[in-house]
Interface confidence: medium
């Protein structure tokens, strides 16, 4: 099954203390999938999409950007034929960066 798309959604964080919002969308006809957000190889958050939606938005509280390091990826799982679990590949990476202070 194809990899999901991933993107940062507004409002974008301006510092490490700001929350981060990341949308993850399954392509095609995979509503109600279970989505996983990863960072640094480990799971950050799990969300299930509503049965009529193909994606979710992960809302990470302020400070989530500090550890573990590395870009975010997401992935989704669905029940396929004969009730067998299937997993997508990882999304492309998305990096969270912060504006350089002007002072």
């Amino acid at each position: 099954i194809p990899a999901p798309s991933i993107r940062l959604v507004p409002p974008y964080p301006s510092s490490q203390e700001d929350p981060i919002h990341i949308a993850c969308m399954a392509p095609g006809n995979f509503p109600g999938a279970n989505f996983t957000l990863y960072r640094g190889g480990q799971v950050v958050q799990l969300l299930q999409a509503p049965t009529d939606q193909r994606g979710v938005t992960f809302n990470l509280s302020g400070g989530s950007s500090k550890a573990p390091g590395g870009p975010f990826h997401c992935q989704y799982g669905v029940l396929g034929e004969l009730n067998q679990s299937q997993l997508s590949d990882l999304s492309e990476p998305v990096n969270v960066s912060f504006p350089v202070p002007t002072w």
Epitope: N34, G41, Q42, L46, H73, G80, L90, P93
Partner: antibody, heavy 117, light 115 residues
């Protein structure tokens, strides 16, 4: 330091069952997917399946689906592999491996399973 | 035809470079896959080396020297593990792996000999 220690291997007759365990330490077990991989003597590795962090989502290789059951107990930091209807071709070293995203980075030392009458 | 094909063996001299290939079956486009590489020495489990999809989507294993690197050859539909400055301790079996059809698939492995 991440450590994975498999146990439960041995010699078993064809058609019988066996349960392997993998004790994990040195990382937050519940935050990582876990895998079982086997390697027959003189052959390359063969992936058997993945169980996600909360245990609700398990994906198996086609070659073993229906005969193998992967489970985990996050309170005990332990991964399990239940193998039923064992065949001669199941003879291999069985490794558990720690998830890295949905792949795997660290492997245990393995436990040998020999299926023989 | 196997999903991933690796040459059974390869020999190279100390200090030289070795290029290990992992060819994807026809109809499977290497450009869309992350290729993972593992090293295995006799009597030990495989060790994770690196993952490579593109220069913007790659990851080196913890403690893996930078002389191990990944790339792709789109014309050959292959992933490549490049080992530069070969050392005697690099003598091992090397396996590639991809996530394909909701399963991890390994190549048959390449036995690298450092002469």
């Amino acid at each position: 330091e991440v450590q994975l220690v498999e146990s439960g291997g041995g010699v078993v007759q064809p058609g019988r069952s066996l349960r392997l365990s993998c004790a994990a330490s040195g990382f937050t077990f519940s935050s990582f997917a876990m895998h079982w991989v086997r390697q027959a003597p003189g052959k390359g590795p063969e992936w058997l399946g993945i169980i996600l962090y909360e245990g609700g989502h398990v994906v198996y290789a086609d070659s073993v689906r229906g005969r193998l059951t992967i489970s985990r107990d996050n309170s005990k930091n332990t991964l399990y592999l239940q193998m039923d209807s064992l065949r001669d071709e199941d003879t291999a070293v069985y490794y558990c491996a720690k998830g890295f995203y949905h792949a795997f980075d660290v492997w245990g030392q393995g436990t040998m399973v020999t299926v023989s009458s | 035809q196997a999903v991933l094909t690796q040459p059974a063996s390869l020999s190279a001299s100390p200090g030289a470079s070795a290029s290990l290939t992992c060819t994807l079956r026809s109809g499977i486009n290497v450009g869309t896959y992350r290729i993972y590489w593992y090293q295995q020495k006799p009597g030990s489990p495989p060790q994770y080396l690196l993952r490579y999809k593109s220069d913007s989507d790659k990851q080196q294993g913890s403690g893996v020297p930078s002389r191990f690197s990944g790339s792709k050859d789109a014309s050959a539909n292959a992933g490549i593990l490049l080992i530069s400055g070969l050392q005697s301790e690099d003598e091992a079996d090397y396996y590639c792996m991809i996530w394909h059809s909701s399963a991890w698939v390994f190549g048959g492995g390449t036995q690298l000999t450092v002469l």
